[in-house]
Structures are given as structure tokens and as C-alpha cells.
């Protein structure tokens, strides 16, 4: 996009070509050669039909923002420079983005910035085999959020299937009864317990181990249990099915799940 | 009206540092980008040095940039050219000119000229 | 740098003639993305300042009279005077402003016959 023929302009905008994952952010900077006593600084999106859409706007040491409080426009400390963010980029972010400033009287003229490039990628799941750990460029905050997280949830687990083996070992082997049904089903929620944020793992596959002994017949064991995290504080909500051998790492909230974790 | 006078000009041996100034009047100066253009005898015309409004930012050609330097004061409506390690290529009438057309580098208005002779 | 080149060097014309002198850039001075040229004219009389006649191609200055006419595009420039007056004896310069270090042609001088 940035050709080297471009002719000298009072405001840049850099960078011109801007590669960012669906939810990160994506910070432009917007910088002019000089500050007039008086201008309005406007940050645009360029339509398909190669109309500007004004996003935000700088005027008078103001900020004004627009319709989407998603696009934010912050004064750098020299005056000069501005950074144009979009918080928590969506794949339809993707297009052709410029300044333009505005220089009021008594020299009233338009100054627009050469166009920058943002291409929105699509968020890349880590593959099941690797170990649980938050994705590579995630913001600062989340980061150790979504690491806290993580560890809670590993350890739960880890107790829970501490538990479960207990439960299923010792009395098969004191009383050798078959205890394969539901008597012993974990962390059931109580009638009482409302509201509670539930993060359904559903399915559970759990190995059996070789050395447990065969249960007596005709109690054929079943291979699979259920398991049910409850956190407080929020209403249950479907949950998704894994393999307790191919648990995916904890990926961050997105977007569409409310403004607790993402800037506003 | 828009006025811009240059003062500061003379004859200068080589080696030796000169300093020109401009005063400008008639318009808001500190609004405006500055220039200084000069033209040798019987030669075009050459751009020297600019600045912004504010003085943040300079702009040099090759042939005098580390020996010239561009400023102003803008309490004072006055721009000056340093010039350092002269030559006698640097003969010249100098311009003091003034881009009204914020943020674009042509000339809307020039100063009469102050000439400098570089000469031994 | 941009190298700006102007012919013819000089030329006489009588009073009430049309002349052109034009000027070429050693690249395109258009900007696509704002569809303007970055060029500019200017007169230099004798024992005169230099005085700005058009810019952004063809765009008079304020003042200027009407029979000064800037036109082309891309690297070929034209200014045209249509009906030269003995006022207008003088040095014309292009000057490029699409790129630093800005640079002049070496100028068209109008002799009066």
C-alpha cells in the first residue's frame, strides 16, 4: 500500500499494513508534522464505494467518540501523535483506514493522511495435544486472567478425577459392589444453589485403569461419567462436550460474552 | 497585507557563518510553514530549508543540510537561517518565503531578498 | 530527486500572442489517491521577488489574471499565457512540491518582441 512515489504529506499514518487476531486490539498512530492553533483531527474508514466514515474524532483537546465506542482515539503526550484503536477487533474490521485533519480559519484547508491497511484474522485455536495455555498475544489484563483461570480449573479437575478414582477403587476393592451407577455423582448442584455460573464440560471420558479389578458381572461398567463445575455468580448456560484425555486449552471470553473481561 | 522582509545579507569569506533573518507581517505567522529559497547569479531558483508552524519540524536539501539551520520565533514573527562552514557555492539572493496553504510546500508569498556573497 | 525540466530555455513572442512553455517531471507528480498535481508556477520579473502564479496544476492564485492558464498531468505540464501583454516580460518557473527535497526547473524566459 505504502508506495515509495507517495507524495510528502503533513500526516502520517502508520502502520500501513496491520495484521491483528480477531479480539486484540489494533492500534494505528496518526501523526502530524505540526500542530495548527486550531484543527479537528477525524479518524475514517473507507467504505466500498471509497467514502470516508468518520469513526472518532479530536477537537479543541477533546475527544469525541462514535456511534461504535469501539474505535478510540488517545493524544500522545508530544501533541503530535495520536493512537486510533479498535478494541477487541471483529473480522468485518478489516478494510482501508486514514486521518485527516481539518485546519481551521483563518487558513481553512482538509489534509488527509495516505490510507493504512487492517486485515482481522480469525482467532487460531490451539491443537488438542498441547497443554492447556492462554493463546500467544493476548493483552496484558487477560493475560494473567485467563492464566489464573486456567490453573483453577486444571486443579478442579485434577481433584475431581483424584476423587472419582477414590471413590470407584476402594470400595470395589473392600466390598467388591458394583458402583457404576449414578449414587456417586459429583458436585451435583443443590435445588438451593441458584444463581450459579455453571461451565458444563459435559462428557468426561475417563480411562479406566488397567490394574482396577473387573467388577463382578452383570454390573458392565460404563466408560464415561459426568461432570459439572459450578462457580457463583452466574446463570447456567449450555456447556460444550470434551475428552477428559483431549482437553482444550482455556481460551479467552470473546467478544459476545458480555463486557466483564473486554475494555468498553 | 502580507509582508516579509530579509535582512542579514552581506559578503562573507568561506568557512565563515552568517546569520539572515526574516520579519514577517500582515498575517497570523505563527499559523504558517517558512521557507527559505535562494537563487545564485544567472542560475534557477533552489529550495534551502524549511519549518512548521511551531518550529517541530525542519526540512534540509543534501547540498546544505549539517552546515544550515532553519528556525523561528514566533513571539518575535521572525524566521532565521543560520549558515555555517559557507562556501562560495552558497552565493546567492535568499528568499524568505511562506506557504499559506498549510501542510504544502509552495509559495505563496516572497520577501524582496538579502543577498550573500561568499568570497575570499 | 525529482528533476524538473523546462523548454524551451527562452522565447519571444510579440504582444497579443499565445505562448506555452512546458515543464516535465522525471516522475508523475499525480496523486492518485487525491487526484491532484503537485506542481506549481511562478513569474519572476526583473528586479522583482518571485511571485506564485498557479498551483495544484492549474489552480490560479487569487489575482493572478485569466490569461494565465496551467494544465497537464502526471510528469508533462503546460502554462499557457493566450494573449501575452508587456507586462508579463519575465523568468517562469515550475516548481515540484510532491516530494522533499523540493525542486525548480531551470526556467522559461519571455522575451517581448
Known amino acids: 500500500l505504502d508506495s515509495p512515489d507517495r507524495p510528502w504529506s503533513p500526516l502520517t499514518f502508520s502502520p500501513a499494513q496491520l495484521t491483528v487476531q480477531e479480539g486484540e486490539n489494533a492500534t494505528f498512530t496518526c501523526s502530524l508534522a505540526d500542530i495548527p492553533d486550531s484543527f479537528v483531527l477525524n479518524w475514517y474508514r473507507l467504505s466500498p464505494r471509497n467514502q470516508t466514515d468518520k469513526l472518532a474524532a479530536f477537537q479543541e483537546d477533546r475527544i469525541e467518540p462514535g456511534r461504535d465506542r469501539r474505535f478510540r482515539v488517545t493524544r500522545l503526550p508530544n501533541g503530535r501523535d495520536f493512537h486510533m484503536s479498535i478494541v477487541a477487533a471483529r473480522l468485518n474490521d478489516s478494510g482501508i483506514y486514514l486521518c485527516g485533519a481539518i485546519y481551521l480559519p483563518p487558513n481553512t484547508q482538509i489534509n488527509e493522511s495516505p490510507r493504512a491497511e487492517l486485515s482481522v484474522t480469525e482467532r487460531t485455536l490451539e491443537p488438542p495435544t498441547q497443554s492447556p495455555s492462554p493463546p500467544p498475544r493476548l493483552s496484558g489484563q487477560l493475560q494473567g486472567l485467563v492464566i489464573g483461570v486456567t490453573s483453577v480449573l486444571v486443579g478442579v479437575l485434577l481433584l475431581l478425577l483424584l476423587t472419582w478414582v477414590l471413590a470407584a477403587v476402594f470400595p470395589r476393592a473392600t466390598r467388591g459392589a458394583c458402583v457404576c451407577g449414578s449414587e456417586d455423582e459429583p458436585l451435583k448442584e443443590g435445588p438451593d444453589a441458584a444463581p450459579v455460573f455453571t461451565l458444563d464440560y459435559g462428557e468426561l471420558d475417563f480411562q479406566w485403569r488397567e490394574k482396577t479389578p473387573e467388577p463382578p458381572a452383570p454390573c458392565a461398567p460404563e466408560q464415561t461419567e459426568y461432570a459439572t463445575i459450578v462457580f457463583p455468580g452466574r446463570p447456567a448456560s449450555p456447556g460444550r462436550r470434551a475428552s477428559a484425555s483431549s482437553l482444550q486449552g482455556a481460551q479467552p471470553p470473546s467478544p459476545e460474552d458480555g463486557p466483564g473481561l473486554w475494555p468498553l | 497585507e502580507v509582508q516579509l522582509v530579509e535582512t542579514g545579507g552581506g559578503l562573507v569569506q568561506p568557512g565563515r557563518s552568517l546569520k539572515l533573518s526574516c520579519v514577517a507581517s500582515g498575517f497570523t505567522f505563527n499559523n504558517y510553514w517558512m521557507s527559505w529559497t535562494r537563487q545564485a547569479p544567472g542560475k534557477g531558483l533552489e529550495w534551502v530549508a524549511s519549518?512548521?508552524?511551531?518550529?517541530?519540524?525542519?526540512y534540509y536539501p543534501d547540498s546544505v543540510k549539517g552546515r544550515f539551520t532553519i528556525s523561528r520565533d514566533n513571539a518575535q514573527n521572525t524566521l532565521y537561517l543560520q549558515m555555517n562552514s559557507l562556501r562560495s557555492e552558497d552565493t546567492a539572493t535568499y528568499f524568505c518565503t511562506s506557504a499559506l496553504n498549510w501542510g504544502y510546500w509552495y509559495f505563496d508569498f516572497w520577501g524582496p531578498g538579502t543577498m550573500v556573497t561568499v568570497s575570499s | 530527486d525529482i528533476v524538473m525540466t523546462q523548454t524551451p530555455s527562452s522565447q519571444a513572442v510579440s504582444a497579443g500572442e499565445k505562448v506555452t512553455m512546458s515543464c516535465k517531471s522525471s516522475q508523475s507528480l499525480l496523486y492518485s489517491e487525491n487526484k491532484k498535481n503537485y506542481l506549481a508556477w511562478y513569474q519572476r520579473k526583473p528586479g522583482q521577488s518571485p511571485k506564485l502564479l498557479i498551483y495544484?496544476?492549474?489552480t490560479r492564485e487569487s489575482g493572478v489574471p485569466d490569461r494565465f492558464i496551467g494544465s497537464g498531468s502526471g510528469t508533462d505540464f503546460t502554462l499557457t499565457i493566450s494573449s501575452v501583454q508587456a507586462e508579463d516580460l519575465a523568468v517562469y518557473y515550475c516548481?515540484?512540491?510532491?516530494?522533499?527535497?523540493?525542486?525548480f526547473g531551470s526556467g522559461t524566459k519571455l522575451e517581448i518582441k
Open positions: 495544484w496544476a492549474s
Open positions: 516548481q515540484q512540491y510532491y516530494n522533499f527535497p523540493l525542486t
Open positions: 519549518i512548521t508552524n511551531s518550529g517541530v519540524s525542519t
